[in-house]
């Protein structure tokens, strides 16, 4: 009995559900009463889930597995694994027995994205060119272990005195801390890239150090050079800092955040106290850090409409300002694929394949490709429509003449998150059966 599973590992994010695909070809007259299906861990042979004696025997794996019972009769023996954990990583074997017997193993690769690195500098006061400083880059709760790269403001690698440590927490997720010891030049940007090798995701943090004192008559206000990227619905920190002089007190401080283009007031701190949010009550200062020169703004429950430039004005005796850009993003959903017509297909037939992905931002890039990854640039029409929250739904239609058989894949790419959502449909010339979601 031929049992088919994917060649490539199934990659699943921690906390999401994964489908371990497995299929067989039922003969005419096949009934579920004849079927024995067993899923087990390949190495330890621990039972995961089984279907015997015509019924689902249930999960033997922390009650987190399920079969696609309504698809079993068509030969779909796939296993749904819920709330994936790091400990689930490994090989699962699908055993199918009817009259004959067959088995195949599928690998589950677990992954978790690393957080945007936070950067700290020690010492962080009274720096002069030639001083040695320690820059620490910390990124949290990723899997598997990260690769860490340091670079200057031009992207050139910094391969000097770097020490990187990675520690797994009780869920098996890694926190990474990388320390760069560097001798300061006149000024410089130091960036840390934390790469997840499975997700091919790069998390980026940077710090710009200007050792010489700012000229008198101006407060030097520092903000990140790169746009702050925030997911819709999450909180974002718009970083802004200044260097308080000895004897500085908050009574001397005037801090104003406003929208750069419209000059609309967002938040202010004047006359020694927080004047509160003037921006839909969704902003806050880090009041306990203000005296140390941290004028950053917390923006809660980010919306698409928040995207743009925010200016941080700081006035003590002197005055300074700088603008920071907020780039809003939302990941696109896994594309759903529809086929028209979807019955009695023959080579030479023209079909319309529609790929739909929802609630992303900004507008997506859509690519079609065949089963080998070669681009399909034929008759494609893509439309994107924003909903009332400004999130886009994308629909891309490919008209194609069928070959003997083929796989048609749609990649919906979020250009800001550099996230690719992938959907595919395989047409074999027989009546269609879609793979389960």
């Amino acid at each position: 009995l031929e049992v088919q599973v994917p060649e490539d590992p199934v990659v699943a994010l921690v906390g999401t559900d994964a489908t371990l695909r497995c299929s067989f070809s039922p003969e005419p007259g096949f009934s579920l009463a004849q079927l024995n299906l067993i899923w087990q861990l390949t190495d330890t042979k621990q039972l995961v889930h089984s279907f015997t004696e015509g019924r689902d025997q249930g999960s033997a794996y922390a009650n987190r597995t399920a079969l696609f019972l309504d698809l079993l009769a068509q030969g779909n023996a796939s296993l749904r694994l819920q709330r994936v954990r790091v400990a689930d990583e490994g090989s699962f074997t699908c055993f199918v027995s009817i009259r004959d017997f067959g088995s195949a193993a599928v690998s589950l690769q677990v992954a978790a994205p690393y957080s945007k690195p936070s950067m700290t500098l020690e010492p962080n006061k009274d720096l002069r060119p030639g001083d040695t400083v320690t820059i620490t880059c910390s990124s949290y709760r990723g899997y598997p272990e990260a690769e860490v790269f340091w670079q200057d403001g031009q992207g050139a690698p910094l391969t000097g005195n770097v020490t990187t440590s990675q520690m797994a927490n009780e869920q098996g997720l890694f926190d990474v801390h990388s320390v760069l010891r560097v001798v300061l030049g006149a000024n410089g940007t130091y960036s840390c890239l934390v790469r997840n090798p499975v997700l091919q995701q790069d998390a980026h943090g940077s710090i710009t150090i200007t050792p010489q004192r700012s000229p008198t008559g101006a407060v030097e206000v520092q903000v990140p050079e790169d746009p702050v990227v925030a997911l819709v619905g999450t909180d974002a920190t718009l970083r802004c800092s200044f260097s308080p002089e000895p004897g500085f007190s908050l009574a001397q401080l005037n801090l104003i955040w406003q929208l750069t283009d419209t000059k609309q007031l967002v938040h202010s701190f004047t006359e020694g106290r927080d004047q509160g949010s003037a921006y839909a009550n969704r902003t806050a200062l880090f009041l306990d850090l203000l005296a140390q020169g941290n004028a950053s703004l917390r923006l809660q429950r980010v919306r698409v409409a928040d995207e743009g430039s925010f200016t941080c004005f700081v006035s003590i005796r002197d005055f300074g300002s700088a603008a920071v850009s907020l780039q809003v993003a939302a990941p696109y959903s896994k594309p759903s694929m529809t086929l028209e017509p979807n019955k009695d297909l023959r080579p030479g037939d023209t079909v319309t394949i529609t790929c739909s992905s929802y609630r992303g931002y900004p507008e997506a890039e859509v690519f079609w490709q065949d089963g080998q990854g070669a681009p399909l640039t034929g008759n494609v029409t893509t439309s994107q429509m924003a909903n009332e929250q400004g999130l886009f739904d994308v629909h891309s239609v490919l008209r194609v003449v069928l070959g003997a058989n083929g796989t048609y894949s749609c990649l919906v790419r979020n250009p800001v998150l550099q996230q690719d959502a992938h959907g595919s449909v395989t047409i074999t010339g027989q009546p269609m059966t879609f793979p389960p979601e």
């Epitope: 403001g153 031009q154 992207g155 391969t159 790169d226």
Partner: antibody, heavy 122, light 106 residues
């Protein structure tokens, strides 16, 4: 569409200087660094250096320090490379090239200028 | 600096033939990048991060390797593949290229 349009061929005398331009369009100039690459006739590629248009920061190949100076003009989205004290060894095609990303490990150059041919001859 | 040595310097292949060229680094590098260049043209990105094909590159190309040893393979040579291929690293300064492998059609 991203484009990098370089200035035309140059014929200069030994000892002179030359300034090659690379005018960009189709993307935000300050969001990507700009690299310069030398290709001597029938030979391989040599990296000269890189400039960050956002703040003018530069990183050079030690071999070209003192030979090449990289600058930008943000208002016209143009990058420049000046080469000085020219000798016949500097005769080559010079390319400007934009990398895929500064914030990711994608260190490949996905857009290149058409090249500027420099001939140093008396 | 890291020296990249490409071999062979010159090779020829018939249509349909499998082709493999190598790039050896004098010190370990994290990732390798490859470019294709044809006469009187600028280089084109071909493979990034060791094994990923750049946009528009045919699926018959593949890249692999780690540490100091990397390779580019064409599963079935086609006429349009005749070109010079350069490897590139930027794991340490300065960024360096290999001397190139010139692939001709037999």
């Amino acid at each position: 569409e991203v484009q990098l349009q370089q200035s035309g061929p140059e014929l200069v005398k030994p000892g002179a200087s030359v300034k090659i331009s690379c005018k960009t369009s189709g993307y935000t100039f300050t969001e990507y660094t700009m690299h310069w690459v030398k290709q001597s006739h029938g030979k391989s590629l040599e990296w000269i250096g890189v400039i960050n248009p956002n703040n003018g920061g530069t990183t050079y190949n030690q071999k070209f320090k003192g030979k090449a100076t990289l600058t930008v003009d943000k208002s016209s989205s143009t990058a420049y490379m000046e080469l000085r004290s020219l000798t016949s060894e500097d005769s080559a095609v010079y390319y400007c090239a934009r990398p895929h990303s500064l914030l990711r490990l994608r260190r490949e150059f996905d857009y290149w200028g058409q090249g500027t041919t420099l001939t140093v001859s008396s | 600096q890291i020296v990249l040595t490409q071999s062979p310097a010159l090779m020829s292949a018939s249509p349909g033939e499998k082709v493999t060229m190598t790039c050896s680094a004098s010190s370990s590098v994290s990732y390798m990048y490859w470019y294709q260049q044809k006469p009187r043209s600028s280089p084109k990105p071909w493979i990034y991060l060791t094994s990923n094909l750049a946009s528009g590159v045919p699926a018959r190309f593949s890249g692999s390797g780690s540490g100091t040893s990397y390779s580019l393979t064409i599963s079935s040579m086609e006429a349009e593949d005749a070109a010079t291929y350069y490897c590139q690293q930027w794991s340490s300064n300065p960024l360096t290229f290999g001397a190139g492998t010139k692939l001709e059609l037999k």
